[in-house]
Amino acid sequence: ESALITQQDLAPQQRAAPQQKRSSPSEGLCPPGHHISEDGRDCISCKYGQDYSTHWNDLLFCLRCTRCDSGEVELSPCTTTRNTVCQCEEGTFREEDSPEMCRKCRTGCPRGMVKVGDCTPWSDIECVHKESGTKHSGEVPAVEETVTSSPGTPASPCSLSG
């Protein structure tokens, strides 16, 4: 492996700068944006857009950048010190219990409930009982029992007769 970082390894805004040599570890660790060499003598820069490290480390190689899945949008690109930030596309959300996939938001609330929270990239719509104000458990209701509203629009009180 070359002791110098090539211009292609650098972010566009860094390419005008002179080439950087490997730095030395500090107390056996390398700074964010680097990994340690196998002999432990050098800190080697991660490759911009390919891999990264976010903390002081003794990794033998930087961590691979995440590629956003289909159904996700890239909020910010991978840099040498930060992984890619991906977000679910509009109309879908990622649950804490299943972060590996984006799920479709429900299109509306069950009969007798009103929407109080919109679909966001990190949460489904929120429904509460009209009278009691208690939250809905989250089961998807039958289609004919659904009060629909388009994503991103506040729900208006509905006049369904019980």
């Epitope: 976010t54 990794l59 033998l60 804490e96 299943s98 972060p99 590996e100």
Partner: nanobody, 126 residues
């Protein structure tokens, strides 16, 4: 059910050392990264260190760099944190944690971790 049980905390003088352990009940321990976090009174839980699933390489918070060393014994399903040159500001409850499914290779934020131990108290005072 995932169970994480920390031990090894206690009271120590500044400059002293402690070794924390975390025993895991989960069979996937050997294929998962694991982390240590800490929470001082009145403060938010913060990242301390995390180690790769294969124990080859780790992350450290800048505040503990060069003083703390994380290690992992997959056969024993145990995580360790060797703490030396302890300071008053290291006083906190220390938690070990396993990440949620589908997170990065080496997670380092509280939200990326879904399984937590009950914590062990470390007090550093003269």
């Amino acid at each position: 059910e995932v169970q994480l049980l920390e031990s090894g905390g206690g009271e120590v003088q500044p400059g002293g050392s402690l070794r924390l352990s975390c025993a895991a009940s989960v069979s996937t321990f050997g294929t998962s990264p694991v982390g240590w976090f800490r929470q001082a009174p009145g403060k938010e839980r913060e990242f301390v260190s995390a180690i790769r699933w294969d124990a080859v390489g780790a992350y450290y918070a800048e505040s503990v760099k060069g003083r703390f060393t994380i290690s992992k014994d997959n056969a024993k399903r145990t995580l360790y944190l060797q703490m030396s040159s302890l300071r008053a500001e290291d006083t906190a409850v220390y938690y070990c944690a396993l990440p949620r499914r589908g997170e990065s290779e080496l997670p380092s934020t509280v939200k990326e971790y879904g399984y937590w131990g009950q914590g062990t108290l470390v007090t550093v005072k003269p």
